[in-house]
Each structure stands twice: as structure tokens, then as C-alpha cells.
């Protein structure tokens, strides 16, 4: 009779996380009598996975009926595989004794676990930034195996190139994590923009996972201000409007000052939205010129999204007050943009709400 051999036909087996792994093992002889044990790893620190003779192994089932006569198949199935189950598994024949002693081991089967990466999580800067500034976005995904993975960044469908990616740990591990940081230059048109992190992995069968961040959470577009004087609405009254254009987000408070004294404060509510996602708002102030002996300096002061206030002033020259309605007053527009912002034609308003 030839001496028993332990045959593990598969050098390696790859299984998706959550599935069952079948590890094949056959022996070539019924001699010697004794149980089969399965171990993960070799040497004194090896981990017992299954012992035919005794023990409770809830995740392990034998593939064939080991009690049946002439059974030489000691393959096992391990259920609900996780990345922690990766390793080399050895089928070992023991010889009956007191205690049973190890007789012969199979060559081992390496179990690798294919684990899907978690959904990528994209996070942007803690504070908003203004156009022309460069901001960093991070993307993280965890728990994948094997280590090979591809990560790409996109802004509105256009692939980005300025990013750095790390996969940890560097050495062997049951599962891995990826961390990437991309730099994005903001533009005034980015309110509706998206930054996308795309992760491709063998477990995803060509259908990458995506994480997104809306630049609306990151960008702040400061308003431009324009103060204009309207024709006289009634005798001795001048209508002065403050156009607040192209701002984002909507949080905005406007204060009118007459000669440096607060006249009225209001919060932007009924705004108009531009196609690019920014907002416009207009406020007006009725000034009774007859109540003023001297020239009046009107200031529209805007505090946008908690930032330092910006303002624009308009000088009303008080001189003779003509009685006839509808005639030009002596008030003169000498406004200056104290913020230094350039005004530009706002031709993409969807609609206008005049508010006062």
C-alpha cells in the first residue's frame, strides 16, 4: 500500500466577500485512521479552522459526508467570507492516538478575498473660498481587496490632473484604504459645478463607484453693487436703488446709511436666480430731499455670508427744490464703488423682483 498523500488541488482560490469559499482536499488512502484538521497558516501560531474529531465550527461545513465509508474527500466550505479570512489554508491528516498526532499536510491553498471598496466620500474645505482661489478636496474609500485600485477626479466631466493618491497600508493586509487629495481652482461659474471622485476596482465589474461634492458648498461669489438714482417719484422725493448682483450663497444683509447714519437694514429674501446659480437682489430707498438742508451721502452697505461689509455710495446734492412735478432735481449722482468691483451687464436674469 502506498503511503497516504494529502492532495490540495488548488494553489489559490479567490472569493468575493460575503460568499462561501470551497477549499478542496482529498486523501489517497484510508490508512492511517485518524481525523482531518484544517488550519490557516503554518507553524505554532497556525489557526484551527476545522477539526473533524471535535469542536464547534459554525461557519464550516464539509462538502462530502465524511462519515460515509471510503470517504476520502475532506473539502470544506467556509461561509460569509470577509477580508479577514484571507490566508493560506492547510488540510492536515492526523493519525489516531492518545492524543492524535499530525501525520501529513497538504501543500496549502491560498485564499484571497475580493472585497468591494466602500462608497467614496468626498469632502471639501471647511470654509468657503472665492473664485480664483485653489481649494483642496479629499476622497476616501475603505475595505477593498486586492490592493490594486484606480482613482480619478473630475470637475463637471473633465478629468483633473492635480491630485495625489495614497493606498494604505503599503505592505500585505487583509484589506486596504485609499486617500486622495485634489486641487481645484474656483471660477465664478462654479455654483452649479460638481467635483467627482471615481474609484475602479476588480470587484466592481467595470462599474466604478463615485463620490461627489457640490461646489455650491464650497464657493462664495461676492456681490457687485451698483447704486443708481431713479427719476423723482413725487415732489421732493428721490428713489435710490442698490443693485446687488451675482452673489452666492444667498445669505446677505443690506443696510442703507444716510450721511453715515443707519436708515434701514434688510435681509435678502425675494431674490432672482441667474442661470449660473448666483443671485441678484435690488433694494431701494426713498429720500425726502426737502428734509435735507445739505448734500446727502447715501451708502448701500452689504454684508454677504458673514464676510466684512462692502459698500457703494451715492451723493445727492441738495440745492433748489423745483416745484413742478417730474422735472429734474438738482440732486446729482456722484456715486463711487468703494469696493472697487467692476460692474458688468447682468443679461442673464430670469426675472426681476423690485423689493423695498
Amino acid at each position: 500500500e502506498e503511503e497516504l498523500q494529502v492532495i490540495q488541488p488548488d494553489k489559490s482560490v479567490s472569493v468575493a466577500a460575503g460568499e462561501s469559499a470551497i477549499l478542496h482536499c482529498t486523501v489517497t488512502s484510508l490508512i492511517p485512521v485518524g481525523p482531518i484538521q484544517w488550519f490557516r497558516g503554518a507553524g505554532p501560531a497556525r489557526e484551527l479552522i476545522y477539526n473533524q474529531k471535535e469542536g464547534h465550527f459554525p461557519r464550516v461545513t464539509t462538502v462530502s459526508e465524511s462519515t460515509k465509508r471510503e470517504n476520502m474527500d475532506f473539502s470544506i466550505s467556509i461561509s460569509n467570507i470577509t477580508p479577514a479570512d484571507a490566508g493560506t489554508y492547510y488540510c492536515v491528516k492526523f493519525r489516531k492516538g492518545s492524543p492524535d498526532t499530525e501525520f501529513k499536510s497538504g501543500a496549502g491553498t491560498e485564499l484571497s478575498v475580493r472585497a468591494k471598496p466602500s462608497a467614496p466620500v468626498v469632502s471639501g474645505p471647511a470654509a468657503r473660498a472665492t473664485p480664483q482661489h485653489t481649494v483642496s478636496f479629499t476622497c476616501e474609500s475603505h475595505g477593498f481587496s486586492p490592493r490594486d485600485i484606480t482613482l480619478k477626479w473630475f470637475k463637471n466631466g473633465n478629468e483633473l490632473s492635480d491630485f495625489q493618491t495614497n493606498v494604505d497600508p503599503v505592505g500585505e493586509s487583509v484589506s486596504y484604504s485609499i486617500h486622495s487629495t485634489a486641487k481645484v481652482v474656483l471660477t465664478r461659474e462654479d455654483v452649479h459645478s460638481q467635483v467627482i471622485c471615481e474609484v475602479a476596482h476588480v470587484t466592481l465589474q467595470g462599474d466604478p463607484l463615485r463620490g461627489t461634492a457640490n461646489l455650491s458648498e464650497t464657493i462664495r461669489v461676492p456681490p457687485t453693487l451698483e447704486v443708481t438714482q431713479q427719476p423723482v417719484r413725487a415732489e421732493n422725493q428721490v428713489n435710490v436703488t442698490c443693485q446687488v448682483r451675482k452673489f452666492y450663497p444667498q445669505r446677505l444683509q443690506l443696510t442703507w446709511l444716510e450721511n453715515g447714519n443707519v436708515s434701514r437694514t434688510e435681509t435678502a429674501s425675494t431674490v432672482t436666480e441667474n442661470k449660473d446659480g448666483t443671485y441678484n437682489w435690488m433694494s431701494w430707498l426713498l429720500v425726502n430731499v426737502s428734509a435735507h438742508r445739505d448734500d446727502v451721502k447715501l451708502t448701500c452697505q452689504v454684508e454677504h455670508d458673514g464676510q466684512p461689509a462692502v459698500s457703494k455710495s451715492h451723493d445727492l446734492k441738495v440745492s433748489a427744490h423745483p416745484k413742478e412735478q417730474g422735472s429734474n432735481t438738482a440732486a446729482e449722482n456722484t456715486g463711487s464703488n468703494e469696493r472697487g468691483s467692476s460692474d458688468y451687464k447682468d443679461d442673464d436674469d430670469k426675472h426681476h423682483h423690485h423689493h423695498h
Epitope: E1, G34, P35, Q52, K53, E54, E65, T67, K68, E70
Partner: antibody, heavy 119, light 110 residues
């Protein structure tokens, strides 16, 4: 280590039934066959039957097929052999034995249960 | 059923001498490359103990003075040098089909 602990001696009248128990320890009960063998005083060994506790598959010696019933309780790792319609020539020591190699052999034995059938 | 017949029924051998017990089957107990024959030793007041499995393989802890041989229908248990503790009844058993035992051979010291 493997141990098979059998129930105590029984005295029965002819026509009665007896149920002998065999509690296993030191191994996974459902992974190995249990055999039952008897030995009349001064006589040889006589195989009665065997049972696979994993699925209750049984094989009986034709001589005992109509009178013997093997059962197991996997929750307590206990095997039972019931013999009905007892006769005086059923007086014997009844052994349970575990088949460690699935060779239909008897590797580990209990100490035996003496069943005496007498009127 | 396969019937096993042992010979002799009893045997007396001097200490240190060879003892040989035979077991003949009514038909071959060979199958699948194995001879499905086993030998047991039973001492007074004790359960039997497995000595040899599949005709020629010593069970764990069995002294190497015990050996089994044979194939098909004819088998032999040999004790190469009898020791006092070997006094017992020896049984053969087959499992080619459902198990049966031989009638036993009583071994004594001459």
C-alpha cells in the same frame, strides 16, 4: 479523549423492552458512527447494528432488524439501543462502540451494560 | 452474509514464542484496494480493543509484536513473542458488507 459512558445494568422479564444509553464525549458526536455489539455470558461478540448520528442512517443485523431500534439525541451526544420482546437468550453485555475511521470497525468501546432477562 | 471462521478455537503458547491465529472468510472481504478485516483483543471483564485494521495496520498504541497479514479470504494475526499480558480472546471482524465477527480464539500460556 474519547469516552463512551453506558447506562447501568438492567433486569427485565421476558417480553419486556430495554433501552440502553451510551453518552459520548471527547469528540464531535455527529461525525462518527456508533455500533452496538452484544456478548452473551461465555460467548463471542455479536454485531447488532450501527447508526450515523449526523443523519440517523442505520444498518441492522438481519437477526435484530425487527426487535432493535437505534436512535440518537445529538443535543446530549447520546446514542440509544432499544431491544423489544426480550427473551432469556438476550441476556448479555451490550456494548456501544465508536467507528473512528468510517471503516465500519470499532475503535473505542463503552464498558458495557449487562441486561439480564429472567422471569 | 460473510461468515468468518477462526482457527484454532483455543491456543496455548509458551512465553516468548510465536502465536498465530487464522481467520477465513466465506467470500473475499477485499474491495476498493483494501481488505476490510479487523482484529480485536478482549481480556476478561473488559470490552474488546482494536488491534489491527484493514488487515495489516496496527492501531495506535499496539505493540509491534502484533502484526496482521493476508488478503481476500485468508488472514492471520501473529504475535511474534508472546507476553503474559497477551492472554485474551482474539476476534476477527470484517466490514466488506455489514459487520460480522469470527467466533473467537482463546490464547493461553503453555
Amino acid at each position: 479523549q474519547v469516552q463512551l459512558v453506558q447506562s447501568g445494568a438492567e433486569v427485565k422479564k421476558p417480553g419486556a423492552s430495554v433501552k440502553v444509553s451510551c453518552k459520548a464525549s471527547g469528540y464531535t458526536f455527529t461525525n462518527y458512527w456508533i455500533n452496538w455489539v452484544r456478548q452473551a455470558p461465555g460467548q463471542g461478540l455479536e454485531w447488532i447494528a450501527m447508526i450515523d448520528p449526523s443523519d440517523s442512517e442505520t444498518h441492522y443485523n438481519q437477526i435484530f432488524k425487527d426487535r432493535a431500534t437505534l436512535t440518537t439525541d445529538t443535543s446530549t451526544s447520546t446514542a440509544y439501543m432499544e431491544l423489544r420482546s426480550l427473551r432469556s437468550d438476550d441476556t448479555a453485555v451490550y456494548y456501544c462502540a465508536m467507528d473512528y475511521g468510517s471503516l465500519y470497525a470499532m475503535d473505542y468501546w463503552g464498558r458495557g451494560t449487562l441486561v439480564t432477562v429472567s422471569s | 452474509d460473510i461468515v468468518l471462521t477462526q482457527s484454532p478455537d483455543s491456543l496455548a503458547v509458551s512465553l516468548g514464542e510465536r502465536a498465530t491465529i487464522n481467520c477465513r472468510a466465506s467470500k473475499s472481504v477485499g474491495s476498493s484496494g483494501y481488505n476490510w478485516l479487523f482484529w480485536y483483543q478482549q481480556k476478561p471483564g473488559q470490552p474488546p480493543k482494536l488491534l489491527i485494521y484493514l488487515a495489516s495496520n496496527r492501531d495506535s498504541g499496539v505493540p509491534d509484536r502484533f502484526s496482521g497479514s493476508g488478503s481476500g479470504t485468508d488472514f492471520t494475526l501473529t504475535i511474534s513473542s508472546l507476553q503474559a499480558e497477551d492472554v485474551a480472546v482474539y476476534y476477527c471482524q470484517h466490514s466488506r458488507e455489514l459487520p460480522t465477527f469470527g467466533q473467537g480464539t482463546k490464547l493461553e500460556i503453555k
